[in-house]
């Protein structure tokens, strides 16, 4: 259904292979990426409320797909604050004791349960902060053909930002 206005391969914005996205735009894509859909000649990336497409062979496209596959983009993305770049250690980062592992949040009930139960939080190197200010996440849904539903994918809880007193993302444990 490439070319269809309502299909999963409709593109709000096409990025030419001749002019790949800037570093800043790529960071924005990483942060807001929700899903991707492989089309015949290009890949469509679904963001919060819009979509962008690029050629299947373009390096930036492959990088973004890999990023989402590994859950290092989108809901799980915490990002690096630009002015803190110099604070990132070049030697192995020394971590404070982490309080645990993350878990995907599927339902409001689970979200409430996990909020009550959670003591878990990923550890960040000193000086690292999350730049993701989004506090709420939708439940995981499949991508509708109109392409506007959001997918809170694997480990969606990883970058839930805590109140400002806590630096870094929160990882929450759901009830099993």
């Amino acid at each position: 259904n490439e070319g269809s206005v309502t299909g999963s391969c409709y593109c709000g914005k096409r990025i030419s292979s001749d002019s790949p996205p800037s570093v800043q735009f790529m960071n924005r894509l990483r942060k807001h990426l929700r899903a991707y859909h492989r089309c015949l000649y290009y890949t469509r990336f679904q963001l919060l409320s819009w979509s962008v497409c690029g050629g299947n062979k373009d390096p930036w496209v492959q990088e973004l797909m890999s990023c989402l596959d590994l859950k290092e983009c989108g809901h799980a993305y915490s990002g690096i604050v630009a002015h803190q770049k110099h604070l990132l250690p070049t030697s192995p980062p020394i971590s404070q004791a982490s309080e645990g592992a993350s878990s995907d949040i599927h339902t409001p009930a689970q979200m409430l349960l996990s909020t009550l139960q959670s003591t878990q939080r990923p550890t960040l190197p000193v000086g690292s902060l999350s730049s993701d200010k989004e506090l709420t996440r939708p439940n995981e849904t499949t991508i509708h053909t109109a392409g506007h539903s959001l997918a809170a994918g694997p480990e969606a809880g990883e970058n839930q930002k805590q109140p400002e007193k806590n630096a870094g993302p929160t990882a929450r444990t759901s009830a099993t």
Partner: antibody, heavy 118, light 113 residues
Framework: EVQLVESGGGLVQPGGSLKLSCAAS????????MNWVRQASGKGLEWVAR??????????FYADSVKGRFTFSRDDSKNTAYLQMNSLKTEDTAMYYC?????????WGQGTLVTVSS | DIVMTQSPSSLAVSAGERATINCKSS????????????LAWYQQKPGQSPKLLIY???TRQSGVPDRFIGSGSGTDFTLTISSLQAEDVAIYYC?????????FGGGTKLELK
């Protein structure tokens, strides 16, 4: 060819420390999500720890059983991951495997044996 | 945590016959962001590290013989060895990487009948 080579294992007394290293080659290390998985003799596989990539601030995650005792770190410039293990217990005795999760699959090393005994 | 239930725990199959191992997860491993199932299958022989056979539930790792077939989606997955060879005798594990902590099935010991 993808290679993960673990080192640093050995015999240590309860309460002691060890630092495991995992040297990687054959793939883009900085893009991989690294994990440690262990296996006690004759037992199943148990996930131990995970470290994310630089864009995600090298955030780390730990199994409840090692929380507060183990520290996972990585040095992308050296293509190496590290697991600092403190306050070791007899139940930490296992083969420790370094794994690299990439979009092309999950690569495993040959493992390094950690024995905690008095 | 996601619980992975693998069955059977042991299996004896004649050479040349089909072997089927099942794995069930306590929640769906299908991510709507990319329509991929976050499930892997491993083979482990005594004294060796686990060897990746299948990832994304059905993608065969490079160099793995095509008699190893991964199938399934959501919560139910199957590893099929279409024609068992003597060198396939090993313990097989399924693993979910949809969520942290990674969790593994209890293993299936595959033997020659």
């Amino acid at each position: 060819e993808v290679q993960l080579v673990e080192s640093g294992g050995g015999l240590v007394q309860p309460g002691g420390s060890l630092k495991l290293s995992c040297a990687a080659s054959g793939f883009t290390f900085s893009n991989a999500v690294m994990n440690w998985v262990r296996q006690a003799s004759g037992k199943g596989l148990e996930w131990v720890a995970r470290i994310r990539t630089k864009p995600n601030n090298y955030a780390t995650f730990y199994a409840d059983s090692v929380k507060g005792r183990f520290t996972f770190s990585r040095d992308d410039s050296k293509n190496t991951a590290y697991l600092q293990m403190n306050s070791l217990k007899t139940e930490d005795t296992a083969m420790y495997y370094c794994t690299a999760w990439t979009t092309e699959g999950i690569y495993w090393g040959q493992g390094t044996l950690v024995t905690v005994s008095s | 945590d996601i619980v992975m239930t693998q069955s059977p725990s042991s299996l004896a199959v004649s050479a040349g016959e089909r072997a089927t191992i099942n794995c069930k997860s306590s929640q769906s491993l299908l991510y709507s962001g990319n329509q991929k199932n976050y499930l892997a299958w491993y083979q482990q022989k005594p004294g060796q590290s686990p060897k990746l056979l299948i990832y994304w539930a059905s993608t065969r790792q490079s160099g793995v013989p095509d008699r190893f077939i991964g199938s399934g989606s959501g919560t139910d997955f199957t590893l099929t060895i279409s024609s068992l060879q003597a060198e396939d005798v090993a313990i097989y594990y399924c693993q979910q990487y949809y969520d942290t902590p990674w969790t593994f099935g209890g293993g299936t010991k595959l033997e020659l009948k």
